[in-house]
């Protein structure tokens, strides 16, 4: 339970007062307000929204609300020279062109400044050539093509379906395969749920709908021109040739009506198996090129987008802590959208707005949190997590010394089935205890706790009677806080019953059809799921900022470290002969995990027993908890990924959205059987085991008695 000592407040000002103040009707009203026009990063409309939020947060009662601006590299289509793809005949005549924009949703026909679908940061170019269908363009898809089917993508334009992995990884894989262009499309198999109508009659993707998105491979760098440092007024910027993470080949997204026209003519090899077939009425032939009658026809891309240094604006609100003002709990989510942002991000921004309003109401009644709470409305998340990363780069010294926790608040919903939580193991117990106190919004669970409905619908694969909590990956604004700075982080949202499609997003993701009406008509008419997410996110922030002892349980880290060590060991043991030949041992890692487990257990015992009325000892114990996540940071970073510095977790090298455990060892082992110099490759595995073992041991020692 929260404790309110030393914060000069009346007894009614507890977690219950905060939660009771949150209202579904307010979230609905805020969502409507935030979604009537586009709020693309770098535009006047998004600047105006930043100023509106600043003004409203001040009215709500925060101590200060400031705009923090940066000048970062963004990307826009050319307004007078649209991007499209053609099928051309042998004379070079365009016999088919893909669409120039999506048909606007009803009621939005006269809205100006709807950015047409494009792949942000695509270089300009007009490549033409034969098409190769590469399935999802995952690492394993290119292995299948190149190694098994002996199909060479060099000099070809590849067409890949969206889904399974982050689009930037698809583009990187295509580049490495030698492709000269990439077409991304949404297949109904991934973006059209059976039995549901297309928007505006349901929540499915229509044939003219297209997913926008950036195609960068930043690996946590933030602004491509100022990696490691804020893009401020005196910044030194790299030349575009040295910019971090930019794609080198043209890329463009299309919908499934256009994809049908490209794929129906495909010839060459048949698909290798049924996992390469989507739901269109086409053969899903791999190519290269078109079938007999159409073999002289080619595909040509016309990409004219430009990269421009543009000003962006974060909104940073502060609610000063009464007892430990130098300890920061951060709640942040982005404000910029591709178009209307009905789900992404405004379903999250509306929840943050209501959380701020509730905290402000308590503050006006005389309450303050024990620790300082920072609220953030990030800009340019869609262009590579730029706003959050630049702010964290600017404030890194403060954050690494004072950052207790970061709670992310992007989309509140991606479905309406059950809760989904990804967080540091330090927060498992916080999430469990909180959800046991909250009411489930789910049909059939009236009067039951959120914990109960969540556990029933999304059970943990390891522990019966507990819900699934996933690893943090990336693709959202917690990245810099967790992966670079080592600040304990978490995220929560309502999700779909669609585990197999985990990383594909909801059907209308990043399309023009992501509107207020989508949410209000189809996902959450009563806004009860939004309210539940507000209670989870807000409740976590309240506890983190207000509990006397930080609600972190280091024993849960010990449990997962053992699980991750077992997993990586079993991967390595697929090569028993090489492990013997090169004397590869995991003993040091298992020993470090054992030490961590014992020391964490002893620390937890001391945590129960110490004198909480002694402010020095209290602060000391809390600092050990706060700095535990920090202890997993390697200042040198992961190989070739200097801004991914967490040794236990990193975004997967094959899918930015997914988290990988012991990523240094995992990447060293990946496809090791194909390495030209096995001795060197296994040497790197041994080095990564050493780094991991050292880091776990060092982290354990931060929990030992200080003297």
């Amino acid at each position: 339970k929260s404790s309110n000592e030393a914060t000069n407040i009346t007894p009614k000002h507890n977690m219950k007062a905060f939660l009771d103040e949150l209202k579904a009707e307010n979230i609905k009203k805020f969502l409507y307000n935030f979604t009537q026009i586009p709020h693309l990063a770098g535009t006047e409309q998004n600047f105006q929204l930043a100023k509106q939020i600043q003004s409203q947060w001040k009215e709500f009662g925060l101590d200060s609300v400031e705009l923090a601006h940066y000048d970062v590299l963004l990307s826009y289509p050319n307004k007078t020279h649209p991007n499209y793809i053609s099928i051309i005949n042998e004379d070079g005549n365009e016999i088919f062109n893909t669409s120039l924009f999506e048909p606007p949703p009803p009621g939005y026909e006269n809205v100006s400044d709807i950015v047409p679908p494009f792949s942000a940061f695509s270089p300009q170019g007009m490549p033409e050539g034969d098409l190769v269908y590469v399935n999802y363009a995952r690492t394993e898809d290119f292995f299948k093509l190149e190694r098994d089917m002996k199909i060479n993508c060099s000099g070809k334009i590849v067409i890949a379906r969206y889904g399974k992995v982050f689009r930037g990884n698809k583009v990187k894989n295509a580049q490495l395969a030698g492709a000269k262009g990439v077409i991304l499309y949404s297949d109904p198999a991934d973006y059209f749920a059976p039995g549901v109508k297309s928007y505006p009659d349901g929540w499915n993707l229509p044939g003219g709908g297209v997913q926008r998105g950036n195609i960068l491979n930043l690996n946590g760098a933030g602004d491509p021109l100022t990696p490691g440092y804020p893009a401020n007024e005196y910044a030194y910027r790299r030349g575009i040739a040295e910019a971090v993470g930019l794609p080198s080949i043209p890329v463009h997204p299309i919908g499934y009506y256009d994809a049908q026209k490209l794929l129906e003519k495909m010839g060459g090899s048949a698909p290798p198996d049924s996992s390469w077939r989507g739901s269109l009425k086409v053969p899903y032939n791999v190519g290269p090129g078109f079938t007999g009658n159409f073999s002289t026809q080619k595909v040509k891309m016309h990409i004219h987008s430009t990269n421009e240094v543009t000003r962006i604006y974060n909104v940073i609100g502060t609610l000063r802590g009464a007892v430990e003002p130098d300890r920061y709990v951060i709640l942040g989510g982005h404000r910029d959208s591709w178009v209307f942002g009905g789900i992404d991000p405004q379903s999250g921004a509306a929840v943050v707005h209501e959380i701020v309003r509730s905290f402000g109401t308590l503050k006006k009644e005389g309450w303050r949190p024990r620790r300082t709470i920072l609220f953030a409305s990030w800009d340019a998340e869609e262009f590579g997590l730029l706003g959050s990363t630049e702010w964290a780069e600017e404030n890194s010294r403060l954050l690494q010394e004072r950052g207790v926790a970061y709670i992310n608040a992007d989309s509140s919903i991606e479905g309406n089935y059950t809760l989904r939580v990804d967080c540091t193991p330090l927060m498992y117990s916080l999430v469990h205890n909180l959800t046991k106190e909250l009411k489930s919004p789910d049909e059939g669970f009236e009067g039951k706790s959120l914990y109960e409905s969540w556990t029933k619908k999304s059970p943990s694969p390891e522990f019966s009677g507990m819900p699934r909590i996933s690893k943090l990956g990336s693709g959202n604004d917690f990245e810099v806080f967790f992966q670079r700075l080592g600040i304990a982080s978490g995220r929560a949202r309502y999700t779909k019953n669609w585990e197999t499609n985990k990383f594909s997003g909801y059907p209308l993701y990043h399309s023009v059809y992501e509107t207020y009406e989508l949410v209000e008509k189809f996902y959450d008419p009563m806004f009860k799921y939004h309210l539940t997410v507000a209670q989870v996110r807000g409740g976590m922030v309240f506890e983190l900022a207000n509990s006397i002892v930080l609600p972190f349980d280091c024993r849960d880290y010990a449990v997962v470290l053992r699980k991750y060590a077992d997993k990586i060991y079993s991967i390595s043991m697929k090569h028993p002969q090489e492990m013997k030949t090169y004397s590869v041992s995991f003993d040091s890692l298992f020993s470090a995990v054992k030490n961590f487990t014992e020391i964490a257990s002893k620390f937890s015992e001391r945590l129960q027993d110490f004198d909480k009325s002694n402010p020095i000892v209290l602060r000391m114990m809390n600092d050990q908890l706060m700095f535990l996540e920090r202890a997993f940071i390697d200042p040198l970073g992961l190989p070739d990924r200097p801004f991914y510095r967490h040794v236990i977790y990193a975004p997967s090298s094959h899918n930015k959205y997914a988290g990988e455990s012991f990523p240094g060892i995992y990447d060293a082992l990946f496809d090791i059987e194909s390495k030209v110099d096995p001795s060197k490759a296994w040497g790197e595995v041994k080095r990564q085991i050493y780094v991991a073992a050292f880091t776990v041991q060092a982290a354990a020692e931060t929990l030992s008695e200080v003297a």
């Epitope: 499209y84 088919f96 062109n97 893909t98 669409s99 120039l100 924009f101 999506e102 048909p103 606007p104 009803p106 026909e109 229509p206 044939g207 003219g208 709908g209 919908g255 009506y257 256009d258 049908q260 026209k261």
Partner: nanobody, 123 residues
Amino acid sequence: QVQLVESGGGVVQPGRSLRLSCAASGFPLISYGMHWVRQAPGKGLEWVAFQTYDGSNRYYADAVKGRFTISRDNSKNTLYLQMNSLRAEDTAVYYCARDRIVGGRVPDAFDIWGQGTMVTVSS
């Protein structure tokens, strides 16, 4: 309610030009592919031209290719057919029709028709 109203027909000499208009109301032209169809006296319906909602693709019947141009002004909710080098065999009632597929990329079936405008090509 949803309707299409054609205008611009008339009597014109062979070799001359005419521009037909089709004003759409009750729905946004910007979301729909549109067709021109014609019916010569005593004959069946003949499809003439189609343009996608965004203007990116135009398809024509062989009989009119190179002479007729379909276009639209989505801001005015109006479809056009520019007819050049008219011939006697172009004499017909010209109808505009809405394609039934929102955002369709190729001609499909029609779901809404206008009342038609008569074009007579005669010397």
